[in-house]
Amino acid sequence: KAMHVAQPAVVLANSRGTASFVCEYASPGKATEVRVTVLRQADSQVTEVCAATYMMGNELTFLDDSICTGTSSGNQVNLTIQGLRAMDTGLYICKVELMYPPPYYMGIGNGTQIYVIDPEPCPDSD
């Protein structure tokens, strides 16, 4: 069963290589456990960046070595991706799955184009 997922079209990473965006889903039922996955599409390749499953009222926890962090509020997930470099510029797609209670629903956003500009190295000062 399909579900609508909204996310911003474009986000610019800051000078420290951190980008944040909101992923919002239109829950057709009373979701109490949700799985959020961030996918990166570059060329025709799609790779998983990070994923987290959370219960409503519980914090959103990614794996310890994940480059993602996030918080949830109602039907919104605030996602932050860290450690980005210019080569990581690409389309980042938010996938949301309503895992429990049944029935299962899944929705995929149109993607957020994240632009990352590597900072210029500071010139040596004598």
């Epitope: 456990e33 219960m55 409503m56 009222g57 519980n58 429990y100 209670p101 049944p102 029935p103």
Partner: antibody, heavy 120, light 112 residues
Framework: QVQLVQSGAEVKKPGASVKVSCKAS????????INWVKQAPGQGLEWIGD????????NSNQKFEGKATLTVDKSISTAYMELRRLRSDDTAVYYC?????????????WGQGTLVTVSS | DIVMTQSPLSLPVTPGEPASISCRSS???????????LYWYLQKPGQSPQLLIY???NLASGVPDRFSSSGSGTDFTLKISRVEAEDVGVYYC?????????FGGGTKLEIK
């Protein structure tokens, strides 16, 4: 090890209420939903509902709406089910069970059951 | 509600022999995500139910590999390759494709 320990057997009169408890140990209480299941004498299993220990949110079988109220006390890792306006057909063993996401939300640990007898 | 129907009601088996229990659902439990939301539980005499199988064919931790389960979207079979005395009890199939979660009526396996 994971354990769900339920309160003892109860004998109640018709029209009364009863509150059954389910104390969890051996895991992080707020990481798993708790379900409640009814088993009438010599009968099969009937799902009553579930509760999210984080925020007390519930899902329930319409058949038990107005009959069963599910609550939790996070501070003591305990789930409760209160049955109101008891009738003879509420006589049953009531189980609490933990849901496990790795098993696609199957009930992987069950309490020992609480027998509620309704008799005048 | 999804109705789960089991057969037979009672199954006498000789130890060492195979056994087979059927379960039928009133609606397909195969979701478009590829998951079949079918479970098997065993309730041994005087005990609480225990999980045997999840997602139609996966054995829960600690369940002996003499148990197996297969099926289509609506018809499922639990098989025990060689029945042992400790396998006696009532076997229940269940679904969680939709709320309310529902169980079959149970099949009582007994030793001949």
């Amino acid at each position: 090890q994971v354990q769900l320990v339920q309160s003892g057997a109860e004998v109640k009169k018709p029209g009364a209420s009863v509150k059954v408890s389910c104390k969890a140990s051996g895991y992080k209480f707020t990481d798993h939903f708790i379900n409640w299941v009814k088993q009438a004498p010599g009968q099969g299993l009937e799902w009553i509902g579930d509760i999210n220990p984080n925020n007390g949110g519930t899902n329930s079988n319409q058949k038990f709406e107005g009959k069963a109220t599910l609550t939790v006390d996070k501070s003591i890792s305990t789930a409760y089910m209160e049955l109101r306006r008891l009738r003879s057909d509420d006589t049953a063993v009531y189980y609490c069970a933990r849901l496990r996401r790795e098993y696609f939300y199957a009930m992987d640990y069950w309490g020992q059951g609480t027998l509620v007898t309704v008799s005048s | 509600d999804i109705v789960m129907t089991q057969s037979p009601l009672s199954l006498p088996v000789t130890p060492g022999e195979p056994a087979s229990i059927s379960c039928r659902s009133s609606k397909s439990l195969l979701h478009s995500n590829g998951i079949t939301y079918l479970y098997w539980y065993l309730q041994k005499p005087g005990q609480s139910p225990q999980l045997l199988i999840y997602q139609m064919s996966n054995l829960a931790s600690g369940v002996p590999d003499r148990f197996s389960s297969s099926g289509s979207g609506t018809d499922f079979t639990l098989k025990i390759s060689r029945v042992e005395a400790e396998d006696v009890g009532v076997y229940y199939c269940a679904q969680n494709l939709e709320l309310p979660l529902t169980f079959g009526g149970g099949t009582k396996l007994e030793i001949k």
